[in-house]
Interface confidence: medium
Amino acid sequence: EEELQVIQPDKSVLVAAGETATLRCTATSLIPVGPIQWFRGAGPGRELIYNQKEGHFPRVTTVSDLTKRNNMDFSIRIGNITPADAGTYYCVKFRKGSPDDVEFKSGAGTELSVRAKPSAPVVSGPAARATPQHTVSFTCESHGFSPRDITLKWFKNGNELSDFQTNVDPVGESVSYSIHSTAKVVLTREDVHSQVICEVAHVTLQGDPLRGTANLSETIRVPPTLEVTQQPVRAENQVNVTCQVRKFYPQRLQLTWLENGNVSRTETASTVTENKDGTYNWMSWLLVNVSAHRDDVKLTCQVEHDGQPAVSKSHDLKVSAHPKEQGSNTAAENTGSNERNIY
C-alpha cells in the first residue's frame, strides 16, 4: 500500500477580519494510526493550533467528525479571525507511539492572509498660517490595513507632488499596519482655492483609491497690498481720501486711519468683494475737512491683517492749495466705508 500523504490543497487562503477561516487537509490513507495536529509556523517555535487528541481550542472546529474510524478529512475552521492569525498553517500527521506519538508527515502548508482595509486617510496641515513663497508641511495618516503593501501619493490641484516622505509601521510582522506621510508644499498667492490630496491604494480596495483632502484656505495667509489715493474735491473745503486694500486672505482685517499720527477712526472689514482667486478686496474712505488744518496733513492707512503686525501706507495732503473756511473745527467726518467694488 502507498505511504500516507498529507494533502493541503490550498496554498493560500484569504479571510476578512472577523470571519471564519477554513483550512483544508486530507490524508490519503488510514495507516499509520495516530492523531492529527495543526500548527502555525514550522520548526521548534511553531504554535499549536489544534490537537485532535487533547486540549481546549475554543476558536477551532473540525469540518468532519474526527472520531469516525474511517475519517481522512482533517480540515479545521478557525473563528473570528484577526490579522494576528496570519501565517502558514501546517497539518501534521502523527504515528501512535509509546510513550509519545511521533511526527510522521506534514502537509505543504496553507498561508492564511487576513485582509483589512485602510481607514480613510486624514490629512492635516500646519498649526499656523503661512504666506506665499513659504514651504509648509502636510501629514497624511491611514491605519488598520493588512497586508502591509500599500501605495500613497500626494497631489496639489491634480498635479502629483514629489517632495514627500512615507513610513509604514511597524517594520516587522504585525496584526495590522499604519502609514504616515509628510509632504512639503510651496504656497503661491493663487492657493486660496487649492487643495492638497493624499491618495492611498491598497489591494483590498477595488477601483479608486481612498482620498483625504486639505484645503489650503485653512493654511494660507495672503497679506494685503495698500494704496492710498486722494479723490477729487467733493465740496470746496473737503477732500475724499481712499485706502484700497487688495488681494488679502483670510478676511479678518482691521483698518485704522491716522491724521498726523493721531487715530482718526478704526473699522473692521465687513462687506468685502471676492476675487476669482479667492482673495478679498476692500476700500475705506475718509472725508478730510482741509479748512481745519493750517499745515499739510499726513494721512496714514494702517491695516492689521489676521493678527499680524500692522502694515501702513501714507498720503500727504497739501492744505495750502485750499482756501480756509473760518470757524470750522472738524478735521474728519466719520464716514464709514464705501461698500462698492472699486474694480
Epitope: S12, A16, R115, G207, D208
Partner: antibody
Framework: QVKLQESGAELVRPGSSVKLSCKAS????????MHWVKQRPIQGLEWIGN????????HYNQKFKDKATLTVDNSSSTAYMQLSSLTSEDSAVYYC?????????????WGQGTSVTVSS | DILMTQTPLSLPVSLGDQASISCRSS???????????LEWYLQKPGQSPKLLIY???NRFSGVPDRFSGSGSGTDFTLKISRVEAEDLGVYYC?????????FGSGTKLEIK
C-alpha cells in the same frame, strides 16, 4: 470547489422590480468582491457594479446607479441584485462573478447567469 | 468612463493558425497601486464568460499556454499561437483598474 449558483429565469412586468440571487460555495464568501454583469441578447458585457461582503462597500457603474441595488447575506453566503422600474431595456442575462484569487482582481468564477425578460 | 476598443470585431481563422486580438483603452489603465488590471475573457455560445488572462499577461490556472497576453499603458494584445476548435467564441478585454470597470465590445473568433 468554487461555485456560484444563480437564481432561475424571471418573466416580469414593465415597471416592476426583481431580486436576483447568487449563492456562493467553496470559498470564504466575505473575502472577495462580488461583481454583477449584464448581457443583452446578441450584445456584449456591461459591468453593473460590485460589493465587498465583508463590509457591504459598493461601487456602481453610474449608468446602473438608479437601476440596481447590490446587497449580501453573509449568513447564507448569498449576494443579491435588485433591479427596479423595469423596462424592455432591462431584458438580459445577468451574471454574478467573484474575484477568487486574492490580489489579482480578476473575475475567476462566474455564475451560470439569470435570464430576465420584461414583457407585458 | 474608460472606453475599451477591441479590433477586429470578427476574426475568421483556420485551425492551427495564429490569431491576434487588439484592445485599446481610452486612457491609461495603470491602477494607483501600480498594477495594470487588464483581463481577457472567452465566452463560448450558451456559456458564461471564462477568465483566460489577468494582469495583462498572466494565464489563469488551466488555460493552455497557446494563449498569451501582452501590452502596457493603453495598448494590449491577446495572441493564440495555434487556434483549436475549442477556442472559438467571443473574446472580451476588460479593465478593472478604474471604476466603472469596462469591457471591450468583443471579438468573435470563427472558422474561415
Amino acid at each position: 470547489q468554487v461555485k456560484l449558483q444563480e437564481s432561475g429565469a424571471e418573466l416580469v412586468r414593465p415597471g416592476s422590480s426583481v431580486k436576483l440571487s447568487c449563492k456562493a460555495s467553496g470559498y470564504t464568501f466575505t473575502s472577495y468582491w462580488m461583481h454583477w454583469v449584464k448581457q443583452r441578447p446578441i450584445q456584449g458585457l456591461e459591468w453593473i457594479g460590485n460589493i465587498d461582503p465583508s463590509d457591504s462597500d459598493t461601487h456602481y457603474n453610474q449608468k446602473f446607479k438608479d437601476k440596481a441595488t447590490l446587497t449580501v447575506d453573509n449568513s447564507s453566503s448569498t449576494a443579491y441584485m435588485q433591479l427596479s422600474s423595469l423596462t424592455s431595456e432591462d431584458s438580459a442575462v445577468y451574471y454574478c462573478a467573484s474575484y477568487g484569487n486574492y490580489g489579482e482582481n480578476a473575475m475567476d468564477y462566474w455564475g451560470q447567469g439569470t435570464s430576465v425578460t420584461v414583457s407585458s | 468612463d474608460i472606453l475599451m476598443t477591441q479590433t477586429p470585431l470578427s476574426l475568421p481563422v483556420s485551425l492551427g493558425d495564429q490569431a491576434s486580438i487588439s484592445c485599446r483603452s481610452s486612457q491609461s489603465i495603470v491602477h494607483s497601486y501600480g498594477n495594470t488590471y487588464l483581463e481577457w475573457y472567452l465566452q463560448k455560445p450558451g456559456q458564461s464568460p471564462k477568465l483566460l488572462i489577468y494582469k495583462v499577461s498572466n494565464r489563469f490556472s488551466g488555460v493552455p499556454d497557446r494563449f498569451s497576453g501582452s501590452g502596457s499603458g493603453t495598448d494590449f494584445t491577446l495572441k493564440i499561437s495555434r487556434v483549436e476548435a475549442e477556442d472559438l467564441g467571443v473574446y472580451y478585454c476588460f479593465q478593472g483598474s478604474h471604476v466603472p470597470f469596462t469591457f471591450g465590445s468583443g471579438t468573435k473568433l470563427e472558422i474561415k
